[in-house]
């Protein structure tokens, strides 16, 4: 039996997260903060120069498993991290990025220490 | 010794171009990054961005888009910073800053120039 | 951009005091934080990389700690050359970020 005033319609997840969103809020967000139902991440890239830069939010539960994976990809150095323990746990997170493989010696001395 | 020696102080009215140079001695320029920060009458330091000495790319921070431009005459161990349309606000100190590949601390500063805006 | 909140703005000190600045990261920064002194009229010298690895010829009276967002800098025994502004800076990610300063004065 179903109790009172509950519905047998498909109901949204809720979204119970909160993470603290850098260069990739979405529109609704407030004082950098974002809400999902899935993880919080932080990622560190490189741009085109070679520059490392931080974005960090919020990541839908579908999906978020393979993009949580830091599955490497050729000629571009990122690195992502994620989690869910509590509110704003990404602004603890601290992704580096990966070593230089030997291959991308070959782009010169500016890619390499 | 390695040194980064920049240009003479400059005067320059509303609207008018300058071109700031940062001749680097005692090392190879395109071995090291090399950053630009400015420092405004009484304020503390922010990064303009920096430049790719190998590939030649630079990199602007979000404030310093569109007046400002790197640039590198490697033959002359030389890097620039060229502002266009100079307003009050750009009045201050501009450092290059030297940066190991893929640190960005900035180990070596040069001398400094300072701009000011003649009313 | 990350903030990097530096306390405090003003110290007063005699030479062969202690002093401690600190710096607070808006943002896990690692060991990504270094620490710089600019004398009156002089450009920045670095002092402090990766929070606490003293840069050559640095005298070992300057120290930096921390990791993660609380960073440290000490000067064990002040002396009289040390009068300058002091600044921390986050290398992690850009835009890298200084902090806002601490004048340092000798009574």
């Known amino acids: 039996k179903k109790e009172d005033g509950e519905s047998t319609a498909p109901t949204a997840r809720p979204k119970v997260l909160r993470c603290k969103c850098h260069h990739h809020c979405p529109e609704d967000s407030v004082n950098n903060i974002c809400s999902t139902d899935g993880y919080c991440f932080t990622m560190i890239e490189e741009d085109d120069s070679g520059t490392p830069v931080v974005t960090s939010g919020c990541l839908g539960l579908e999906g978020s498993d393979f993009q949580c994976r830091d599955t490497p990809i050729p000629h571009q150095r990122r690195s992502i991290e994620c989690c869910t323990e509590r509110n704003e746990c990404n602004k603890d997170l601290h992704p580096t990025l990966p070593p230089l493989k030997d291959r991308d010696f070959v782009d010169g001395p500016i890619h390499h220490k | 010794q390695i040194q980064l020696v920049q240009s003479g102080p400059e005067l320059k009215k509303p609207g008018e171009t300058v071109k700031i140079s940062c001749k680097a001695s005692?090392?190879?320029?395109?071995?090291?990054?090399m950053n630009w920060v400015k420092q405004a009458p009484g304020k503390g330091l922010k990064w303009m961005g920096w430049i790719n000495t190998y590939s030649g790319v630079p990199a602007y921070a979000d404030d310093f888009k569109g007046r400002f431009a790197f640039s590198l005459e490697t033959s002359a161990s030389t890097a620039y910073l060229q502002i266009n349309n100079f307003k009050n606000e750009d009045t201050a100190t501009y450092f290059c800053a030297r940066s190991e590949l893929r640190n960005w601390y900035f180990d070596v500063w040069g001398t400094g120039t300072t701009v000011t805006v003649s009313s | 951009s990350f903030v990097m909140t530096q306390t405090p703005k003003f110290l007063l000190v005699s030479a062969g005091d202690r002093v401690t600045i600190t710096c607070k990261a808006s943002q896990n920064m690692g060991h990504n934080v270094a620490w710089y002194q600019q004398k009156p009229g002089q450009s920045p010298k670095l002092l402090i990389y990766y929070a606490s690895n003293r840069y050559t010829g640095v005298p070992d009276r300057f120290t930096g700690s921390g990791y993660g967002t609380d960073f440290t800098f000490t000067i064990s025994t002040v002396q009289a050359e040390d009068l300058a502004v002091y600044f921390c800076q986050q290398d992690y990610s850009s835009p890298f970020t200084f902090g806002s300063g601490t004048k340092l004065e000798i009574k």
């Open positions: 005692g090392y190879t320029l395109t071995t090291y990054g």
